[in-house]
């Protein structure tokens, strides 16, 4: 139990896509403010988003330090204007988040088809290798850098003139597929991490079709 007018945060939820990671919670504060702390299982607590009236806190900078670690966050509630005040047990009121392991749980963002190039009866489709906020040696890593061969892409492709789809897979960011000469094709891709049990698949990319500006044709 906390001070009379302070309520504990609840519904603590991790929202994470391509490692951009925000902790959200309820309720909207009335006469109270929040501070968030984050820690790895074996590490020290680090405070973030001090005395905020927001109900979210961007924890990306912390989790990208090691995306394979498991993190726990907690949200402290303080009376507005009296942040030194504590609960009856002498501690501020707080609520723990679920554990969160970014490598296993971050959602895969919607991929984008970067380009496609036709040479005769082959088409090379390239998926954009999205940059993440994960850093190594002062450079930002791409999704492929982080996940390596754990990440695959599924390509859906079909003749513009028909509805019958085909599919192909790659564990790089490129597909080389056979097509019928003289036919226009449309493409969509989906990212998948087969080894996961949750958040395994992205949404489909926007559809790109031959005859539009992303493509190139060569005899």
């Amino acid at each position: 139990s906390g001070t009379t007018n302070t309520v504990a945060a609840y519904n603590l939820t991790w929202k994470s896509t391509n490692f951009k990671t925000i902790l959200e919670w309820e309720p909207k504060p009335v006469n109270q403010v929040y501070t968030v702390q984050i820690s790895t299982k074996s590490g020290d607590w680090k405070s973030k988003c001090f005395y905020t009236t927001d109900t979210e806190c961007d924890l990306t900078d912390e989790i990208v330090k090691d995306v394979k670690q498991t993190y726990l966050a907690r949200v402290f509630s303080y009376p507005a204007g009296n942040v030194e005040s504590t609960g009856s047990a002498g501690e501020p009121l707080y609520e723990n988040s679920p554990e969160f392991t970014p490598y296993l749980e971050t959602n895969l963002g919607q991929p984008t088809i970067q380009s496609f190039e036709q040479v005769g009866t082959k088409v090379n489709v390239t998926v954009e290798d999205e940059r993440t906020l994960v850093r190594r040696n002062n450079t930002f890593l791409s999704l492929r850098d982080v996940f390596g061969k754990d990440l695959i892409y599924t390509l859906y492709y079909w003749k513009s003139s028909s509805s019958g789809k085909k599919t192909a897979k790659t564990n790089t960011n490129e597909f080389l597929i056979d097509v019928d000469k003289g036919e226009n094709y449309c493409f969509s891709v989906q990212a998948v991490i087969p080894s996961r049990t949750v958040n395994r698949k992205s949404t489909d990319s926007p559809v790109e079709c031959m005859g539009q500006e992303k493509g190139e044709f060569r005899e």
């Epitope: 789809k165 085909k166 192909a168 790659t170 998948v192 087969p194 049990t197 949750v198 698949k201 489909d204």
Partner: antibody, heavy 117, light 107 residues
Framework: EVQLVESGGGLVQPGGSLRLSCAAS????????MHWVRQAPGKGLEWVGW????????IYDPKFQDRFTISADTSKNTAYLQMNSLRAEDTAVYYC??????????WGQGTLVTVSS | DIQMTQSPSSLSASVGDRVTITCKAS??????LSWYQQKPGKAPKLLIY???SLADGVPSRFSGSGSGTDFTLTISSLQPEDFATYYC?????????FGQGTKVEIK
């Protein structure tokens, strides 16, 4: 525990239709691809097609494209195979399988479809 | 479409024998190949995926190798419970295709 249970098989006349169901438990089908594979008596395995239940994308072996339709109901956690214009050569055990995108890790027990007059 | 040619179609072997089954793809499928074991009246069971990776719970006497067009399933020391039919499957592009199967029988 992950389980796939097919149902809906049986005896049907040539030219008839049948809808097979694949009820999944222990996981959410929208997180995976779901396939149908068939096996004629004494023969090998033959891939029919797949669905991504999350977005409804379907892929078929072209030989089945015109007569077979795969669908899914994520609220029932069930995939379906609608088979029309059935022929004697469609007689087979029909299996559904879960696909992680790297392998088919779970299969149902199969349901026998017999097409005969 | 990619054809998968599996050989032999059947073989007779004794307990303790080393058994090798091959699958040849009509074109490059990288490592998008898995192997399945099927016993009469039962559903197929995953043994090997991505060509060399052993599925959970599968005994280490089973191994897979190869990439591109040529793949091999090896059983290092055949056990009584290994008498079954084995199938390869390419899942790199549609239509996915199975090999014709290899029936491993008791000599």
């Amino acid at each position: 525990e992950v389980q796939l249970v097919e149902s809906g098989g049986g005896l049907v006349q040539p030219g008839g239709s049948l809808r097979l169901s694949c009820a999944a438990s222990g996981f959410n089908i929208k997180d995976y691809y779901m396939h149908w594979v068939r096996q004629a008596p004494g023969k090998g395995l033959e891939w029919v097609g797949w669905i991504d239940p999350e977005n409804g994308n379907t892929i078929y072996d072209p030989k089945f494209q015109d007569r077979f339709t795969i669908s899914a109901d994520t609220s029932k956690n069930t995939a379906y195979l609608q088979m029309n214009s059935l022929r004697a050569e469609d007689t087979a055990v029909y299996y559904c399988a879960r696909d992680t995108a790297a392998y088919f890790d779970y299969w149902g027990q199969g349901t026998l479809v017999t097409v005969s007059s | 479409d990619i054809q998968m040619t599996q050989s032999p179609s059947s073989l007779s072997a004794s307990v303790g024998d080393r058994v090798t089954i091959t699958c040849k793809a009509s074109r490059d499928i990288k490592s998008y190949l898995s192997w399945y074991q099927q016993k009469p009246g039962k559903a197929p069971k995953l043994l090997i995926y991505y060509a060399p990776s052993l599925a959970d719970g599968v005994p280490s006497r089973f191994s897979g190798s190869g990439s591109g067009t040529d793949f091999t399933l090896t059983i290092s020391s055949l056990q009584p419970e290994d008498f079954a039919t084995y199938y390869c499957l390419q899942h790199g592009e549609s239509p996915f295709t199975f090999g014709q199967g290899t029936k491993v029988e008791i000599k």
